[in-house]
Interface confidence: low
Amino acid sequence: KELKVTQPEKSVSVAAGDSTVLNCTLTSLLPVGPIRWYRGVGPSRLLIYSFAGEYVPRIRNVSDTTKRNNMDFSIRISNVTPADAGIYYCVKFQKGSSEPDTEIQSGGGTEVYVLAKPSPPEVSGPADRGIPDQKVNFTCKSHGFSPRNITLKWFKDGQELHPLETTVNPSGKNVSYNISSTVRVVLNSMDVNSKVICEVAHITLDRSPLRGIANLSNFIRVSPTVKVTQQSPTSMNQVNLTCRAERFYPEDLQLIWLENGNVSRNDTPKNLTKNTDGTYNYTSLFLVNSSAHREDVVFTCQVKHDQQPAITRNHTVLGFAHSSDQGSMQTFPDNNATHNWN
């Protein structure tokens, strides 16, 4: 009977970690000689298995090749890794007497595609916090997947974003691949509760994409609006000043009251009010004894937020000397306010 080496499958796909069978059957055992499996062709091809009874990790013959009438030379590769990808050939040799064995026929080859899951996407953002209206870039990386076809999408609060650039490396054929994508996000003051999500879909993920998440709270700074106001006096000789820092993030806030340029009180906020948009408010009360002041006094509220330059707001309170202007209040365009003591 004429010898024919048949590899019925042109290709097989296997998930990394699983096992696969590479089928090979012969129509005749003649001429006498070994059958060997190789990966690749030419002088650099790699011998995979030779049915010589040797132990090869992860590879076994499917049928008992020691039986005289066996014509099934299929092999099972277990715990497949991306490095096992390639074209496998089942090759029949004629046994040589003194010279080396001679290759007489090869099967058509079976390409093994190793399906390797992408790693969970990692989203990284800028090292420093950005401010509202600033454009910041986020990068998403995932590696170790195969085959090369992969889909990566960006979302912000459910809305899909268009990436600046997405690259899959290497560009040539390889055992596994990496993807990197960059997206640009314009920050806004409502982003403290927002998330940027990188979603990776791949054939190995069974319609359940992997997601990497960046909480914008880690990348945004919203500076406070600072206002100083004078409350109605609680008694004849007391003035209540209020410094209110509104809608700031993160929490890191230092507040200092100055009296005519001299530090009067350090206020370390403890009980911040949280707004629904994730930002914070803080109100500092400063009680001033008016009987100790006859001259005009400039009170300054100095707010340092997240190690940024201080925001200052002045408020002038008129002394007793301004008797004609008692009870009056003037607010100046630069947010300096003037009041008298009584």
Partner: antibody, heavy 119, light 107 residues
Framework: QVQLQESGPGLVKPSQTLSLTCTVS??????????WSWIRQHPGKGLEWIGA???????YYNPSLKSRVTISVDTSKNQFSLKLSSVTAADTAVYYC???????????WGQGTTVTVSS | DIQMTQSPSSLSASVGDRVTITCQAS??????LNWYQQKPGKAPKLLIY???NLETGVPSRFSGSGSGTDFTFTISSLQPEDIATYYC?????????FGGGTKVEIK
């Protein structure tokens, strides 16, 4: 239809090693695509995941128990096993084994085996 | 570890009532959440996988919804055989963690 059956001693002395085996029937442990897990339930309490093994090697442990736990698989016997060393009374619980598909939940459970740690 | 907070810890309802159990994750777990039923002296039984998919053979009165951190499990019409403890379980991050359980009783 895959079925699971836990086996092992019901009483273990403190400081000794608890050893349990889960036998898989009605399917092959090496068919791929599944995790084989151990879960325990302290008396009157909730469920605690101990760890899982994928037949081809990867093993995952709960960090709270990692230093004391070993999970292994024997594909020839279609079994996987749990060893928990240096046990104390706090390890007294019902121990379950389960089959889990990553996106199909723990869909098959053993009936559970009660292990008491006492001298 | 991801903490799964289930509420209420127990409830009592009449046959035919609609019963709702919530489960809150300490971090975003997408839809990587399962729901189980455990009857006294028995092993848990999978009811819902991937937050909202009904396991084969489970009655349609059971349903699940939610994504991210907040999830809901519903029995649309409570039956006597539904007396059990119900657990949620996340598998987004190792280690897998379960909620504390909700014991459902009949009034």
């Amino acid at each position: 239809q895959v079925q699971l059956q836990e086996s092992g001693p019901g009483l273990v002395k403190p400081s000794q090693t608890l050893s349990l085996t889960c036998t898989v029937s009605g399917g092959s442990i090496s068919s791929g695509g599944y995790y084989w897990s151990w879960i325990r339930q302290h008396p009157g309490k909730g469920l605690e995941w101990i760890g899982a093994i994928y037949y081809s090697g990867p093993i995952y442990y709960n960090p709270s128990l990692k230093s004391r736990v070993t999970i292994s698989v024997d594909t020839s016997k279609n079994q996987f096993s749990l060893k928990l060393s240096s046990v104390t009374a706090a390890d007294t619980a019902v121990y379950y084994c389960s089959k889990e598909g990553y996106h199909s939940g723990m869909d098959v459970w053993g009936q559970g085996t009660t292990v008491t740690v006492s001298s | 570890d991801i903490q799964m907070t289930q509420s209420p810890s127990s409830l009592s309802a009449s046959v035919g009532d609609r019963v709702t159990i919530t489960c809150q994750a300490s971090d975003d777990i997408s839809d990587y959440l399962n729901w189980y039923q455990q009857k006294p002296g028995k092993a848990p039984k999978l009811l819902i996988y991937d937050a909202s998919n009904l396991e084969t053979g489970v009655p349609s009165r059971f349903s699940g919804s939610g994504s991210g951190t907040d999830f809901t499990f519903t029995i649309s019409s409570l039956q006597p055989e539904d007396i059990a403890t119900y657990y949620c379980q996340q598998f987004a991050y190792l280690p897998w963690t379960f909620g504390g359980g909700t014991k459902v009783e009949i009034k």
